[in-house]
């Protein structure tokens, strides 16, 4: 193993990470020295993990602390042995305090599951350390949770099947350890953007994995294929959901962050994207009537092409709390687009455009926009993202999504943008013009557009309004209306029917 230890700046703290390497510095020195040095004023040895049963939606309420072997607090605080029990597990912390997302999640769980037990696993003393040390403590914390669960199982009516561990960042791997160490199998683990550093590529027993619970679902919101990935990139659950490709989250760009605060930094962007997993989960709890659907796909690029909007053979699922158990799958990667804020739901459409002739295109890819007109609403002007290139005499597939429910689609306006948007495109246009001076008229022909709704699984074909006019050129538009054969529906199930 290489001796070079990369220095990693995460948020405003620089720390070294190298598994097992002693790191002599950190916030206010080595915290474990403080925690384990005998003090004259602190003689009692306290467990490093506390279990706080949140007995009220009031975030300021102190709740009840549970400890193994002490049954009285369970009675005093009305712990419901037959109800669902949620364990919320926080991650690494720089401040040593619970972050704001915590009470949002607690409150959402109480709102959705009124009789449930909501327990916050407080491992702040072990998490408020150098990242490497916090990572090394995850196993210990997992053991503590497993011990608590083993003790609860001794009680009448308590079932591990009713236990749902929800772990954020480093807490997701803590949940994995807990599920691994407990006697029996917990019902569910949800990993909210599980931590990447020191876990990416790790052995199955040293990170969250599908073996850790009856059902393991994961949301990945801060993965990076270049630079540091704060969240783990690899799939680690039965289903692994990558909203917006699992990397750049809408509303979290530097511009968005700068817009909302005077001194926006990369810190806020990182926090926003990493924490987005929590908010997507909260959204699934409180906006039950607006579920977001994810679609199985081999990779993000194929999803961006609109190829993967199928619900056949369990290829789509609700995200977050409403996800349907899929134990037969492992490491199934699923994708979706989202809005920038709650409710996050969008409506996905696959657009298949058959280009049957293609004149004088040169090197430059055209920029297309579509506007969808529906019975409920009309969309904004939506860009057609060209992932590779426009193919001639072939069907080109695109993904578009709208923030509102348009209802049944009635017509489509396709626009080819005239003016180039970048100097690079302008240069390519100029070169193209020089190389083809006698064929200035760029044009392509489209007869029909086939549209499939991801949410309803309905398919519809749109034909040009004027069958004689199928050509489109820069700065022009082409209108399409529902073809006479109307809605064409295959034997594909709608996610709204299939999912709970």
């Amino acid at each position: 193993m290489s001796n070079s230890v990369p220095l990693l700046c995460f948020w405003s703290l620089c720390y070294c990470f190298a598994a097992g390497s002693p790191v002599p510095f950190g916030p206010e020195g080595r915290l474990e020295d403080k925690l384990h040095k005998p003090k004259a004023t602190q003689t009692e040895v306290k467990p490093s993990v506390r279990f706080n049963l949140r007995t009220s939606k009031d975030p300021e309420h102190e709740g009840c602390y549970l400890s193994v072997g002490h049954s009285q607090p369970l009675e005093d605080c009305s712990f419901n042995m037959t109800a669902k029990t949620f364990f919320i597990i926080h991650g690494w912390t720089m401040s040593g305090i619970f972050e704001n997302w915590l009470h949002k999640l607690v409150s959402a769980l109480h709102t959705r599951e009124k009789d449930a037990n909501v327990v916050v696993v407080d491992w702040l003393p072990l998490a408020h350390q150098l990242y490497t040390d916090a990572v090394n403590n995850t196993r210990v914390v997992g053991h503590s949770i497993a011990r608590m669960l083993d003790w609860l199982q001794e009680k009448d009516d308590f079932s591990l099947g009713n236990v749902h561990l929800i772990g954020y960042s480093l807490g997701a791997h803590v949940a994995g350890y807990a599920g691994n160490f407990v006697k029996g199998t917990v019902g569910r683990i949800t990993g909210l953007d599980p931590a990447g550093p020191m876990f990416e590529g790790a052995d199955i027993h040293k990170r969250l994995s599908p073996d850790d619970a009856d059902f393991v679902d994961v949301l990945h919101t801060y993965t990076r294929s270049f630079g540091l990935s704060i969240g783990i990139q690899m799939p680690v659950g039965h289903i692994d959901i990558y909203p917006n490709g699992g990397d750049f989250q809408p509303g979290c760009g530097l511009n968005d962050v700068l817009g909302s605060i005077a001194y926006g930094t990369i810190t806020e962007v990182v926090k926003c994207e990493h924490e987005r997993a929590v908010h997507l989960f909260v959204d699934s709890l409180v906006n039950q009537d607006k579920p977001s659907f994810a679609f199985q796909c081999t990779d993000s690029n194929r999803f961006k092409k609109g190829i993967c909007l199928s619900c056949r053979k369990n290829r789509c699922n609700s995200i977050g709390y409403n996800a349907k158990k899929m134990r037969n799958k492992r490491n199934s990667k699923m994708y979706l687009k989202t809005r920038a804020g709650m409710p996050f739901r969008v409506y996905h459409y696959q657009m298949k455009i058959h280009v049957f002739s293609y004149k004088n295109m040169g090197e430059i890819e055209p920029t297309f926009y579509v506007t969808l007109y529906g019975t409920n609403a009309d969309s904004q002007t939506l860009p057609l993202e060209i992932v590779e290139r426009i193919e001639q005499n072939a069907t080109n597939t695109f993904l578009v999504y709208t923030e509102e429910d348009l209802g049944d689609l009635l017509k489509i306006q396709l626009t080819w943008e005239g003016a180039s948007q970048s100097w690079y495109n302008l240069w390519k246009e100029f070169r193209s013009y020089l190389s083809q001076p006698r064929n200035p008229g760029r044009e392509l022909n489209i007869r029909r557009i086939r549209v499939k709704s991801g949410e309803t699984q309905r398919k519809l074909t749109f034909c040009t309004e004027d069958p004689e006019n199928t050509s489109i050129s820069p700065g022009r538009e082409l209108w399409f209306r529902k073809c006479r054969d109307g809605w064409r529906m295959k034997n594909e199930t709608s996610p709204t029917v299939e999912l709970p």
Epitope: K46, N52, N100, K104
Partner: antibody, heavy 120, light 112 residues
Amino acid sequence: QIQLVQSGPELKKPGETVKISCKASGYTFTNYGMNWVKQAPGKGLKWMGWINTYSGVPTYTDDFKGRFAFSLETSASTAFLQINNLKNEDTATYFCARFSYYGRHYFDYWGQGTTLTVSS
Amino acid sequence: DIVLTQSPASLAVSLGQRATISCKASQSVDYDGDSYMHWYQQKPGQPPKLLIYAASNLESGIPARFSGSGSGTDFTLNIHPVEEEDAATYYCQQTNDDPPWTFGGGTKLEIK
């Protein structure tokens, strides 16, 4: 009822050490964090940092790193603020104030304050 | 660090009238629909006392003539109708996520 009772006024010379206490009653001491706040004469409030009353881990703001130390005597439900190598600019009233670990971290109960005068 | 700027530094209000104190933050103190801004009252020789938490929630035992509003970076404390016993210095404080948590410079209210 909930109370935070601080030790009495202190008169010290520069270079000396002072230890101010804050005794809590009426609630479970380890279930709430304890803050320390400085108020120089005729000035506003300045947050110094806080201590986790369960783990004993202190957190200091940049201006209060070095000569300042937060500590606990959990069995006596008491938090302490110690200032070493006192300087004239440490002359102020020091308050302890609790906050909930959960929720929005406002300071709901305060000690009556301890006036520290540093003068040669 | 988030800087809180209170205005005015001092104000004199007649008995029964409205007192309005403003607090501007250098960056947003909101988090997912909640504002992490709080208001305290401090009388001479006494510790501060919590009046309003999370921008607009009245602490128990505080008279209803005190109210708070605002979101993002702009917050207001209103006292109406002002009473004699309201003469004090008022401080805003933010506790949005990672410390340091900060206080505004204070506004001294005098009753005419």
